[in-house]
């Protein structure tokens, strides 16, 4: 049967075996304090998973600057707000005399946490779009990109836990948090659902004194206590990579290839998102089909369904088709694709402001999922990005120039030297439920949602209303 024909650089059989068809995401944030280094990296995942890792590395310098100690997870990030808890300033060796330092952590009531969640979700949307535009500006034109705003926000928010003075204010601003957003940490913790596992861990050198208040706050809010590294770089490397592998379901087996001998602080945040399509795609219907890329047409593996449940509409502001596909665990994939080939993705990106995005998501909430003729490429996007340049693009320079982490450590000589963020997002066919062939009747007018040109995507948490992942696809083969 010619239906099986699949002409492309990969035959249909091999394409069908490329993954379970899950959407899984793992984000690792790594922050090392050695020489001014802050690395945030999300490592690639295996088939049908999404991983993001963020690593921040810091080291001691002669400058009295401290470095952020959290690592951005690869999930939607929030805009500057203050940590839910404040760290005490009881240490006798405050880096800066008379300066503000986070006070003791105060836990929030359920009522406070609940009201904070809406603010946090809103902030995460704003932060996600800030990040999207920053990532886009740093990337080559017409290239794929993926990141986890939530991962990055988680890392920066954990840094916020120990930030003082300007660093605190600047972080709040970047994250779009209101000033003194004291419940943010607990709210952030509440944003984890069954489909998303978020874990944090701090590793530090034996000679670095971490404040008890920060240790306690981390334990309470991020469910981890700082672990002491040894004086053996190789052993430390193994310890960190083992932790990462364990906490990303082995999707990221090696976050670090090397560890500087003068590493003093490593902050990791791993987010593993494992979600499947609510409705399975039939792998037999995945074929090599045309996709408009730049000024040509390429062949890519396309998933097809005649009656896939999609909520969709045309947005006139963006001149885009907007479609939402259900995933498990109250998550969904939202796709924004230019209405036709006359409209470019770049133009759509530029028009995508927080207010436009929020209006689209509100409209999607009101839209019904209807059986739709759907054509969607298999997606695998891998992105590695230096986050220091992203932070500077967002006009946050503290990691390089004037970092104040007085609430984290008494040591005034920390500076972020590297921050790397890496994400792999892969979407294949498998879902939780089989397509209900007889359960849905096709409307008299056939509803169509075909995605055969570059598009923007958002992995959306429908309960808390924030982006877990965001990105764009220019070339689904990449």
């Amino acid at each position: 049967n010619p239906n099986a024909t699949s002409s492309s650089s990969q035959d249909p059989e091999s394409l069908q075996d490329r993954g379970e068809g899950k959407v899984a995401t793992t984000v690792i944030s790594k922050m090392l304090f050695v020489e001014p280094i802050l690395e945030v990296s999300s490592l690639p995942t295996t088939n049908s998973t999404t991983n993001s890792a963020t690593k921040i590395t810091a080291n001691t310098t002669d400058e009295p600057t401290t470095q952020p100690t959290t690592e951005p997870t690869t999930q939607p990030t929030i805009q500057p707000t203050q940590p839910t808890t404040q760290l005490p300033t009881d240490s006798p060796t405050q880096p800066t005399t008379g300066s503000f330092c986070p006070g003791p952590v105060t836990l929030c009531s359920d009522l406070e946490s609940h009201s904070t969640e809406a603010v946090l979700g809103d902030a995460l949307v704003d932060f996600s779009l800030k990040l999207y535009h920053a990532f886009s500006a740093m990337k080559k034109v017409e290239t794929n990109m993926a990141f986890s705003p939530f991962s990055i926000a988680s890392l920066l928010t954990q840094v916020l836990l120990g930030a003082g003075e300007n660093t605190k204010t600047n972080l709040e601003s970047i994250l779009s948090y209101p000033k003194d957003f004291t419940c943010v940490h607990q709210a952030l913790k509440g944003f984890t659902t069954k489909g998303v596992t978020s874990v944090s861990q701090i590793f530090h050198s034996p000679d670095l004194a971490i404040r008890d208040t920060f240790v306690n706050a981390s334990r309470t809010l991020y469910s981890s206590s700082p672990r002491v590294l040894s004086n053996n770089s190789d052993a430390n490397l193994e310890l960190i990579n083992t932790w990462v592998a364990k906490n990303t379901n082995n999707k990221i087996s090696r976050l670090l290839d090397s560890l500087p001998s003068d590493t003093r602080l490593v902050l990791l945040n791993a987010i593993y998102l494992s979600a499947k399509w609510k409705t399975t795609f039939d792998p037999k219907k995945t074929r090599m089909e045309p996709f408009h890329f730049k000024n040509s047409v390429i062949k890519v593996p396309m998933m097809n369904s005649k009656k896939y449940p999609v909520a969709h509409f045309i947005d006139q502001t963006l001149k885009a088709k907007v479609g939402q596909l259900q995933l498990s665990h109250n998550l969904s994939l939202v796709i924004l694709v230019p209405q036709n080939l006359k409209h470019r993705l770049e133009d759509m990106e530029q028009a995508l402001s927080p207010s436009v995005f929020k209006a689209i998501m509100e409209k999607l909430e009101m839209s019904k999922f209807q059986p739709t003729l759907l054509t969607l490429p298999r997606i695998k996007v891998t992105t590695s990005q230096d986050m220091l340049s992203i932070m500077e693009k967002l006009e946050f320079f503290d990691f390089s120039y004037d970092l104040n982490l007085c609430g984290l450590t008494e040591d005034p000589d920390l500076q972020v030297s590297a921050m790397q963020h890496q994400t792999v997002l892969e979407l294949t066919e498998t879902g939780v439920e089989a397509a209900a062939a007889s359960a849905i009747s096709v409307a008299r007018t056939l509803l169509v949602f075909e995605v055969q040109q570059p598009f923007l995507f958002v992995l959306w948490d429908q309960q808390h209303k924030f982006p877990v992942f965001m990105g764009r696809v220019y070339d689904p083969r990449a």
Epitope: N1, A4, T5, S7, S296, I298, K299, V448, E450, Q452
Partner: antibody, heavy 119, light 111 residues
């Protein structure tokens, strides 16, 4: 029986227009890409244009871009080719073809309709 | 000139085995794209003979077989019959041209 039936061909002057139609029957039309393929007298086959299942995406050979427009009406099981600014080199038998994959294997063909561009 | 190169003609006697070649490049067959073969009997529309390099649609006799290697493909017809006299076209996707392309065709004569 699976069938494709073209119509609309004829004699037209250079610069003129024609609209070809292709009526499909015997299968679920919206399950397939559709294409137009032409064959000049005594010559080989040339793919001209294709359209996605839902009709949202269209594809053309360079020589007809901007002059020809492919479209489909899934409710009527019909494929169209609007041909404008016709040239002598467009003279050919135009076949409508069903395409189960994505513009590569044409498993069912119509009988063809002749388009002659001449003054 | 066609992107896919076929010999203009081929011939054989009844019962013989005949092979028709189709040579492409790294932007089509060499890019691991599938090759299709079509048969066009005199005065009729083309018919799909082989798809996906070597698969036969139902109704096509197993005397027809296809294969592909590198940037070339070939169609083999064994037990040649008079009714096999026709034009044969290979086809594939071409990245450079962003679309499907056909070979120039091979006229098979059964002597």
């Amino acid at each position: 029986e699976v069938q494709l039936l073209e119509s609309g061909g004829g004699l037209v002057q250079p610069g003129g227009s024609l609209r070809l139609s292709c009526a499909a029957s015997g299968f679920t039309f919206s399950d397939y890409y559709m294409s137009w393929i032409r064959q000049a007298p005594g010559k080989g086959l040339e793919w001209v244009s294709g359209i996605s299942r839902g009709g949202e995406y269209t594809f053309y050979v360079d020589s007809v871009k901007g002059r020809f427009t492919i479209s489909r009406d899934n409710s009527k099981n019909t494929l169209y080719l609007q041909m404008n600014s016709l040239r002598a080199e467009d003279t050919a038998v135009y076949y409508c073809a069903r395409d189960p994959g994505g513009l590569d294997a044409f498993d069912i063909w119509g009988q063809g309709t002749l388009v002659t561009v001449s003054s | 000139q066609s992107v896919l190169t076929q010999p203009p003609s081929a011939s054989g006697t009844p019962g013989q085995r005949v092979t028709i070649s189709c040579t492409g490049s790294s932007s089509n067959i060499g890019a691991r794209y599938d090759v299709q073969w079509y048969q066009q009997l005199p005065g009729t529309a083309p018919k799909l003979l082989i798809y996906g390099n070597s698969n036969r649609p139902s109704g096509v006799p197993d005397r027809f077989s296809g294969s592909k290697s590198g940037t070339s493909a070939s169609l083999a017809i064994s037990g040649l019959r008079s009714e096999d006299e026709a034009d044969y076209y290979c086809a594939s996707w071409d990245d450079s041209l962003s679309g499907p392309v056909f070979g120039g065709g091979t006229k098979l004569t059964v002597l």
